[in-house]
């Protein structure tokens, strides 16, 4: 009949059962063996099922499962028996706190349920089942309970602008095990944590400084503790509030001709910004506010202007970190004085431009004539030294004019000057220094070969490549040009009187 | 080893009571079953009832149902059976039990207590 | 409750026999089965527990078997020292119930 294992002991010791204990451990015995887990995790308050499972062979029984907490340097502590016939029996110190898992139940299985973990139930536990008939087997396991923390954020001192580094705030956890605490902010800023060990959890704790400005003012400062016993991670967030006040300034007097005798609804505002907001004192320096001036906080409204309303105003903003002052000069004009005095103003301006335009003009003719001098200068210096040049080649040129074959479309292409690339655009260049152009190997050629080459481009150039205005420009500077020759052969002759240079419409040099 | 002493001999008046104790040494005394047996003279063996000290619930053979008592005190590691309305059919050696394995059986048995009752 | 019926209830054999006694229960207990041994003015001895398993210091002539319902103790060549009662006990369910008993005598 059953029976159950005690806390010190499992079973008699009697040789058998040791025998049968023995056959157990070696794994000599085809008995079966438990099953549980090394690390059982709950969180604080859960339920933490402690499992001890026997799987044996077919006709093996389980006759009772006795659990005990077995910490390391303490004597074993009796928790329940559970017993195949008698049922569980849960000793006093752990009454109300251990229940068999809820049905259908399995004879073979051990498990218990521990019912709302505290940290105190954190350690070794041993499941002792005696099987009929391999004999008694034991396993361990150990509960870890999850101690999630309960965050807390310490605003630092107040912030006030133009403090140095300074303490923002702190963010304390203390859980098992240690939890993480960091921090989520778009401040920038510098954190530094420390964490102190205690017998059944640790506390962490983190602090965020900064240098305050008044841009922080607003921004959120977020602790963030995450824990294996947090399903999310847990924020706490602070609001910033850097103490601070701006410079101060008066709007109003932009333009000084609207602040004349007899307007009306005039106001001078003062601008100033601050944490905490800031209040607003307006004063005359030079004496008491004018009867009718209104204040209203920032804003100072007067009545219809009058020449008493002239005078120094001053603004004086404040709040609990500092003060500021600002201050203006009122002047109110008379109209009938003031219409001389704009007449003066219009004609002293109109003057002004007059003479600046002049002067620009003067400066326009002046540029456009020494540029016409020069150019006229290097016109007459180059066609000096193409006249030079054109009596030096003529002799050679004709030479090799009548050394070629008679048609000119059969020439190799290096004897061509200038080539068209099949571009219209090639024939238009307005440097005229791109007519004699200089081969590689320090060749030149003469007008005769550019003539030639005008009217092998033009033949090649398709129809269409061109503009109609371009390709008129181009047939007529070659009529021109043909004038001066005689064609023999395919072939251009020069006339007898032909030894004149022709630049046409283009600026070429034929 | 595994023992179990029980107290000596004991004669009854009809319609008295009687307390038969059983000292169990060797063994963890509070998570084994302790179950008592009894045998009129020439008769077979009768399970009575058993308990578990530890759980201090004792079941009881419908027979015996409201006449006997089992109980433990952990701190001797006694049982104690405690039958009521004695009659003389109620003669017999009175054993208790207990077993080698936890939750299995009878394997050890006490040496047997002789209850006479007799007018 | 579970009645266990224990036949024969009596039975003669000489030293040296093969002797074989039967249990049976009213309703299948697995193998919650234990068979003991009593000599007249002694307390039983436990022989076989679980049907089949021998307890320790038991000569390996004693055997058992059986599941369910049917259950038998064999004793392979009987000993002099053999000659006793035998009773079995089902422990499956309370109440726990014995055997009415065999009683073993010499021919």
């Known amino acids: 009949m059953p029976l159950s294992l005690g806390a010190e002991m499992w079973g008699p010791e009697a040789w058998l059962l040791l025998l049968l204990l023995l056959a157990s451990f070696t794994g000599r015995c085809p008995a079966g063996e438990l099953e549980t887990s090394d690390v059982v995790t709950v969180v604080l308050g859960q339920d933490a099922k402690l499992p001890c499972f026997y799987r044996g062979d077919s006709g093996e029984q389980v006759g009772q499962v006795a659990w005990a907490r077995v910490d390391a340097g303490e004597g074993a502590q009796e928790l329940a028996l559970l017993h195949s016939k008698y049922g569980l029996h849960v000793s006093p110190a752990y009454e109300g706190r251990v229940e068999q898992p809820p049905p259908p139940r399995n004879p073979l299985d051990g498990s218990v349920l521990l019912r709302n973990a505290v940290q105190a139930d954190e350690g070794e536990y041993e499941c002792r089942v005696s099987t009929f008939p391999a004999g008694s087997f034991q396993a361990r396991l150990r509960l870890r309970v999850l101690v999630p923390p309960l965050p807390s954020l310490n605003p630092g001192p107040a912030l006030e602008e133009g403090q140095g580094l300074t303490l923002a705030a702190s963010c304390t956890a203390e859980g098992s095990p240690a939890p993480s605490v960091t921090w989520d902010t778009e401040v920038k800023g510098t954190t530094s944590s420390r964490s102190f060990k205690h017998s059944r959890s640790a506390a962490v704790t983190s602090e965020f400084h900064l240098v305050p400005s008044r841009s922080m003012n607003g921004q959120p400062l977020t602790c963030v503790v995450s824990h294996p016993g947090l399903l999310q991670d847990q924020r706490i967030t602070h609001i910033l509030h850097v103490s601070f006040l701006a410079e101060a300034s008066v709007r109003g007097l932009e333009d000084q001709n609207l602040w004349h005798i007899g307007r009306e609804g005039a106001m001078l505002k003062c601008l100033s910004e601050g944490q905490p907001p800031p209040s607003y004192n307006w004063t005359r320096l030079d004496g008491p506010l004018p009867s009718g001036v209104r204040v209203d906080g920032d804003t100072l409204g007067f009545p219809p202007l009058t020449t008493e309303h002239s005078g120094i105003y001053v603004c004086h903003v404040s709040n609990e970190f500092s003060s500021r002052d600002s201050q203006v000069t009122v002047d109110v004009l008379d109209p009938q004085e003031d219409s001389g005095k704009q007449v003066d103003l219009v004609s002293a301006s109109v003057v002004v431009v007059g003479v600046i335009a002049a002067l620009l003009f003067c400066l326009l003719v002046v540029v456009v004539v020494l540029m016409s001098r020069y150019h006229r200068r290097k016109a007459q210096q180059m066609t000096q030294k193409y006249e030079e040049e054109l009596t030096l080649t003529r002799e050679n040129s004709i030479r090799r004019l009548h050394s070629h074959h008679t048609d000119p479309r059969s020439q190799p292409e290096e004897s061509v000057g200038l080539r068209a690339e099949g571009h219209p655009d090639s024939l238009k260049d307005n440097s005229s220094c791109s007519v004699m152009s200089e081969e590689p190997e320090g060749r030149s050629y003469s007008t005769l070969t550019t003539v030639r080459e005008i009217e092998t481009q033009t033949e090649l150039l398709s129809p269409g490549s061109g503009r109609a205005e371009e390709e008129e420009d181009q047939d007529e500077g070659i009529k021109q040009a043909m004038n001066h020759f005689v064609q023999e052969n395919g072939t251009l002759r020069a006339k007898p009187t032909g030894n004149g240079i022709y630049i046409n419409g283009r600026g070429h040099l034929v | 080893e595994v023992q179990l002493v029980q107290s000596g001999a004991e004669v009854k008046k009809p319609g008295a009571s009687v307390k038969v104790s059983c000292k169990a040494s060797?063994?963890?005394?509070?998570?084994?079953?302790i179950n008592w047996v009894r045998q009129a003279p020439g008769q077979g063996l009768e399970w009575m009832g058993g308990i578990i000290p530890i759980f201090g619930t004792a079941n009881y053979a419908q027979k015996f149902q409201g006449r006997v008592t089992i109980t433990a005190d952990e701190s001797t590691s006694t049982a104690y059976m405690e039958l009521r309305s004695l009659r003389s059919e109620d003669t017999a050696v009175y054993y208790c039990?207990?077993?080698?394995?936890?939750?299995?059986?009878?394997?050890?048995w006490g040496q047997g207590t002789l209850v006479t009752v007799s007018s | 409750d579970i009645q266990m019926t224990q036949s024969p209830s009596s039975l003669s054999a000489s030293v040296g026999d093969r002797v074989t006694i039967t249990c049976r229960a009213s309703q299948g207990i697995s193998n919650y089965l234990a068979w003991f041994q009593q000599k007249p003015g002694k307390a039983p001895k436990s022989l076989i527990s679980a049907a089949s398993s021998l307890q320790s210091g038991v000569p390996s002539r004693f055997s058992g078997s059986g599941s369910g319902t049917d259950f038998t103790l064999t004793i392979s060549s009987l000993q002099p020292e053999d000659f006793a009662t035998y009773y079995c006990l089902q422990h499956d369910s309370f109440p726990i119930t014995f055997g009415g008993g065999t009683k073993l005598e010499i021919k």
């Open positions: 060797g063994y963890t005394f509070t998570s084994y079953d």
């Open positions: 039990a207990s077993t080698a394995v936890a939750g299995f059986g009878i394997d050890y």
